[in-house]
């Protein structure tokens, strides 16, 4: 169900504070704009108020998309989706946000990485990712290369490799050359998920060839 309201909310934290405390899809408004976007809000995990910016769970959505698609978002907020780089960039440049990445493997294990500071640069700077203050159970070293890299897609090669990481590993991501993670890689089902260089990778938790079962990237204001 879509949960719409006359109020304007910039993120799921504002939705939560307005009294909407159930998980679901809500309409958010771009900062300093009337443009709207649909996002899934997790109102239960870790106190709620989380804006889901990425979800992988079943391979139902193709993540080998263009720069424009990653800019505006794609997929279904109730399932697999990418919220959109432009919205996330605008949002995270308004105030300080934390980023939590929740991961599941095929053996029933779960882990997370929490970054206490997160923002994306503007499109002019290729939505470069900035992260600080890593804690969590998915590795003491960041699987997103630091300092952050520019975002790359199959039609927008901004990585640090003479190869084209997005074409080789599939999906849009903040590739280095090509780096220790890609949560937007190919979805591989159980028993086909090992020794896959182009899968859903978080190196400092499961190594380079392991493709994960499920991932969620979520953001919330640091002062929530």
């Amino acid at each position: 169900d879509y949960k719409d309201d006359d109020d304007k909310f910039r993120d799921c934290a504002e939705v939560f504070k307005s009294g909407h405390t159930t998980n679901g899809i809500y309409t958010l408004t771009f900062p300093n704009s009337t443009e709207e976007i649909k996002a899934y809000c997790d109102m239960e995990a870790g106190g709620g108020g989380w804006t889901i910016i990425q979800r992988r769970e079943d391979g139902s959505v193709d993540f080998q998309r263009t720069w424009k698609e990653y800019k505006v978002g794609f997929g279904n907020p109730s399932g697999e989706y990418w919220l959109g780089n432009e919205f996330v960039s605008q949002l995270t440049n308004q105030q300080r946000y934390v980023l939590k990445i929740h991961l599941k493997d095929w053996e029933g294990n779960e882990a997370y990485s929490l970054y206490e500071h997160f923002y994306l640069s503007s499109e002019e700077l290729n939505y470069r990712i900035h992260l600080k203050g890593l804690t969590g159970t998915a590795g003491k070293i960041s699987s997103i290369s630091q300092p952050g890299n520019d975002f790359s897609t199959k039609d927008g090669d901004n990585d640090k490799c003479i190869c084209k990481c997005s074409q080789m590993l599939t999906g849009g991501w903040w590739f280095a050359a090509c780096g220790p993670s890609n949560l937007n890689g190919m979805y591989y089902p159980q028993r086909q998920n090992t020794n896959k260089f182009n899968g859903i990778k978080w190196y400092y938790w499961k190594g380079s060839g392991y493709s994960l079962k499920a991932t969620t990237m979520m953001i919330r204001p640091a002062d929530f």
């Epitope: 440049n93 300080r96 500071h117 923002y119 640069s121 002019e124 700077l125 470069r128 900035h130 600080k132 203050g133 890593l134 804690t135 003491k140 070293i141 960041s142 630091q146 300092p147």
Partner: antibody, heavy 121, light 107 residues
Framework: DVQLQESGPGLVKPSQSLSLTCTVT?????????WNWIRQFPGNKLEWMGY???????SYNPSLKSRISITRDTSKNQFFLQLNSVTPEDTATYYC??????????????WGQGTSVTVSS | SIVMTQTPKLLLVSAGDRVTITCKAS??????VAWYQQKPGQSPKLLIY???NRYTGVPDRFTGSGYGTDFTFAISTVQAEDLAIYFC?????????FGGGTKLEIK
């Protein structure tokens, strides 16, 4: 290539204000990152003073908060340090530097060559 | 503020030696620790960021490690041009703070 250059008076009288300019070339200070002032006292101790981010927000060292102001002139791609009510203990080499994160403190990858300031009557 | 206690203050070494400098944070700094080199008459230069990442163009004889409160910086084979003061810096919490420095002198 990114370059930073400090400028300002080398001698300031006690109780007066210290004003320094950092001119940045090769990168727009409104594009990204935070733009810092750091000082190094005789004896080599380093102290972070504060920054102005690409968005214009500022953060200061609490030990200086009542005396410090960092501003910028985006048309000239410059940012400034003003330190009020100086004493001889403010004698130091002052550096401007770019940090690798735009909304918070972080490591600093580009530094100016530094300018020496003496506070004395 | 997080206090960064850096040891030793002075290192007297010969070319070819391996040297190690340590920094201890008064509380956890996660992996948000950098190491700088300052040669005589110059400004500090970033060598290592996020505890273990070598900055662009930095020779691989310089390495960093650590997490939480204990951090180590090493030069595997000291060269004459490594004469400098080395500083650690935490930027996990504001204000960022520096260690007192280690002066590396060549015998």
């Amino acid at each position: 290539d990114v370059q930073l250059q400090e400028s300002g008076p080398g001698l300031v009288k006690p109780s007066q204000s210290l004003s320094l300019t950092c001119t940045v070339t090769g990168y727009s200070i409104t594009s990204d990152y935070a733009w810092n002032w750091i000082r190094q006292f005789p004896g080599n101790k380093l102290e972070w003073m504060g920054y102005i981010s690409y968005s214009g927000s500022t953060s200061y060292n609490p030990s200086l908060k009542s005396r410090i102001s960092i501003t910028r002139d985006t048309s000239k791609n410059q940012f400034f340090l003003q330190l009020n009510s100086v004493t001889p203990e403010d004698t130091a080499t002052y550096y401007c530097a770019r940090s690798t994160f735009g909304h918070y403190v972080s490591s600093m990858d580009y530094w100016g060559q530094g300018t020496s300031v003496t506070v004395s009557s | 503020s997080i206090v960064m206690t850096q040891t030793p203050k002075l290192l007297l070494v010969s070319a070819g030696d391996r040297v190690t400098i340590t920094c201890k944070a008064s509380q956890s700094a996660s992996n948000d620790v950098a190491w700088y080199q300052q040669k005589p008459g110059q400004s500090p230069k970033l060598l290592i960021y996020y505890a273990s990442n070598r900055y662009t163009g930095v020779p691989d004889r310089f390495t960093g490690s650590g997490y939480g409160t204990d951090f180590t910086f090493a030069i595997s084979t000291v060269q004459a041009e490594d004469l400098a003061i080395y500083f650690c810096q935490q930027d996990y919490s504001s204000p960022p703070t520096f260690g007192g420095g280690t002066k590396l002198e060549i015998k």
